[in-house]
Interface confidence: medium
């Protein structure tokens, strides 16, 4: 009888663990969906506004291949930086390769020097995984150096030629990115 009760308890424990896991997956999926939605809205907005503009990038944006970059002149906390980029039909910078990282850091050296710039990278509170704003994981060579000892949410930023991490509530410049308009010629 005791063994039966013990088996039932173990089964229920296992069921509970599975439900918790499912809930965590659902929460991550919901977060990813919300971000994807924002990402798509920004892309649509970019496409529509670009249709009226013949140059690949708007004024004061820098072009590299298929991307346009905007280096902000204001400081914001990370979340507001993302909102500021979305208002411009863009998102916080997502660094896809070492080549892109080199272009960004080279451009920053020319523009402003050694300041801190938020990028679209944040650490998931539950799993501790680094995620770009579209829900994807950065490549191993593009993981922030562990610099933040913050108990608060941690986000990624670029300084000089490094990717670092900091409390998302600190104030930094930021970099927005959107697709360059393809020439219809």
């Amino acid at each position: 009888k005791l063994l039966q009760v013990s088996t039932i308890a173990m089964q229920q424990q296992e069921k509970l663990i599975q439900q918790e896991r499912a809930l965590l997956n659902f929460t991550e999926w919901k977060r990813s969906c919300a971000l994807q939605m924002k990402y798509c809205q920004a892309f649509m907005q970019n496409s529509l506004s670009s249709a009226h503009n013949s140059s690949p990038c708007p004024n004061n944006w820098i072009q590299n291949r298929e991307s346009c970059y905007y280096v902000s002149e204001i400081w914001s906390i990370w979340h507001t930086s993302q909102e500021n980029c979305l208002k411009e039909g863009s998102t916080l910078l997502q660094i896809e390769s070492k080549e892109e990282m080199d272009f960004i850091t080279g451009s920053l050296r020319k523009i402003k020097g050694s300041y801190d710039y938020w990028v679209g990278l944040s650490q998931d509170g539950h799993s501790g995984r680094w995620l770009w704003q579209d829900g994807s994981s950065p490549s191993p060579g593009l993981l922030p150096a562990e610099r933040s000892q913050s108990a608060n949410q941690v986000c990624g930023y670029v300084k000089s030629n490094s990717l670092l991490s900091s409390n998302c509530s600190t104030w930094k410049y930021f970099i927005c990115e959107k697709y360059a308009l393809r020439s219809s010629v």
Epitope: S72, E73, I74, W75, S76, T80, E83, N84, W171
Partner: nanobody, 124 residues
Framework: QVQLQESGGGLVQPGGSLRLSCAAS????????IGWFRQAPGKEHEGVSC????????YYDDSVKGRFTISSDNAKNTVYLQMNSLKPEDTAVYYC?????????????????KGKGTQVTVSS
């Protein structure tokens, strides 16, 4: 031309208080949010507090919540930062900055819209 002038810094013992002032000129005060920032030697600048002139909303960094209070006097075009229960880790140059005019809330500050700063040293 936006001009901001901080004052009120000084040397104070741990647990003591200081009141910083930020006098603004060259722009319509009501159209901006004003933020207080600080920078300790070798550290990045951090936002301490901010007050939005449009709706009076305030922002405080977790490290100063419950100890610092931001307020403003429209007639004098001045924003104040009352700092109580000061700690050695509050030691820094404190400066105020004006919000980018297009947003009117504590969302973004320009480097060229800030004052020269006032030194606050907390030490026994």
């Amino acid at each position: 031309q936006v001009q901001l002038q901080e004052s009120g810094g000084g040397l104070v013992q741990p647990g003591g208080s200081l009141r910083l002032s930020c006098a603004a000129s060259g722009f319509t005060f009501d159209d901006y949010a004003i933020g207080w920032f600080r920078q300790a030697p070798g550290k990045e600048h951090e936002g301490v507090s901010c007050i939005s002139r449009s709706d009076g909303s305030t922002y405080y960094d977790d490290s100063v919540k419950g100890r610092f209070t931001i307020s403003s006097d429209n007639a004098k075009n001045t924003v104040y930062l009352q700092m109580n229960s000061l700690k050695p880790e509050d030691t820094a140059v404190y400066y105020c900055a004006a919000e980018v005019p297009s947003t009117y809330s504590c969302s973004g500050f320009r480097e060229d819209y800030k004052g020269k700063g006032t030194q606050v040293t907390v030490s026994s």
